[in-house]
């Protein structure tokens, strides 16, 4: 015999108290699949979390972080504070990048400058706490009479993939 609950669509639950008829999920709850015997409580985006997508009867709310924070974990389970470019977040808070390292993001740790000489190139623009070194042509190409090199446009800030 087929389970009568299997006919209950998403957004409803199979109500044992009412002869296993399909009842709509109560307010602030949802069921994302059919055949559920209960509805799940909607996630509430409070504090540093803000609502990215409202809860519906068939899908949970989705949260992201208020400005000055960024998401960590599947479904943005945690908000972590941003730092400024040129800094990294340590367990003791935001700290400036050490000499020879940089961070062009508001999150993550400071990255060592590119060592241009490893690819046989020269330094065209020095690095800073916020920006990597820009490598130019190889030193041999910079002999007297060689044409001048136009520095490239500033690097586009790399994107953040959703976690």
């Amino acid at each position: 015999l087929q389970d009568p609950c299997s006919n209950c669509p998403a957004g409803t639950f199979c109500d044992n108290n009412r002869n296993q008829i399909c009842s709509p999920c109560p307010p602030n709850s949802f069921s994302s699949a059919g055949g559920q015997r209960t509805c799940d409580i909607c996630r509430q985006c409070k504090g540093v979390f803000r609502t990215r997508k409202e809860c519906s009867s068939t899908s949970n709310a989705e949260c992201d972080c208020t400005p000055g924070f960024h998401c960590l974990g599947a479904g943005c389970s945690m908000c972590e504070q941003d730092c400024k470019q040129g800094q990294e977040l340590t367990k003791k808070g935001c700290k400036d990048c050490c000499f020879g390292t940089f961070n062009d993001q508001k999150r993550g740790i400071c990255r060592p400058w590119t060592n241009c000489s490893l690819d046989g190139k020269s330094v065209l623009v020095n690095g800073t706490k916020e920006r990597d070194v820009v490598c130019g042509p190889s030193p041999a190409d910079l002999s007297p009479g060689a044409s001048s090199v136009t520095p490239p446009a500033p690097a586009r800030e790399p994107g953040h993939s959703p976690q």
Partner: antibody, heavy 120, light 108 residues
Framework: QVQLVQSGAEVKKPGASVKVSCKAS????????MHWVRQAPGQGLEWMGW????????NYAQKFQGRVTMTRDTSISTAYMELSRLRSDDTAVYYC?????????????WGQGTLVTVSS | YVLTQPPSVSVAPGETARITCGGD??????VHWYQKKPDQAPVLVVY???YRPSGIPERISGSNSGNTATLTLSRVEAGDEADYYC????????????FGGGTQLIIL
Amino acid sequence: QVQLVQSGAEVKKPGASVKVSCKASGYSFTGYYMHWVRQAPGQGLEWMGWINPNSGGTNYAQKFQGRVTMTRDTSISTAYMELSRLRSDDTAVYYCAREPGYYGSGLDYWGQGTLVTVSS
Amino acid sequence: YVLTQPPSVSVAPGETARITCGGDDIGDKRVHWYQKKPDQAPVLVVYEDRYRPSGIPERISGSNSGNTATLTLSRVEAGDEADYYCQVWNSSSDHPGVFGGGTQLIIL
């Protein structure tokens, strides 16, 4: 969806060079650093270096400096890793892997791997 | 910087496996964990000490303090049998990327 597709297996003689490619799709290639990691038979994972596909800037593990060159072709969203003066202990599976947009997090997408066999 | 892992950890199905990763003041670093099965690419299972990427089950968790980071797999299944690697990034230019030696998880 994000995909990293690597070139096929290679067999090389000691002293030769090998160039492995990694074609990216499903995201902005220039926005994310690419790393190379290898695993020799019966050994663990070993980080080799990274390239910033936007600027071409690189950083190599000290062990590989002077033998490895990482390049990219932004027009075809492809990163390359060339290893020269190959030795038998360079026999390994070589992986490209994407950094998720900032330094200090885990490598979130990986290529399928390229087996490089160095044998006389 | 050196990361030390036990070569293997054995556990019965349904039990909890704990894989450790030791390093000097590793608690000050962000530790990532990868699962590696034969003939497959590594998969990121925990990043920045304790965060799971989408699609990784909640029974996998991580922690990090002092000189030891730990990957915990609860209610272990046969499909969890794999090698697990911890990894950190340094700001040092000599060797920014460091992996532990790996731990083989054996399901009894």
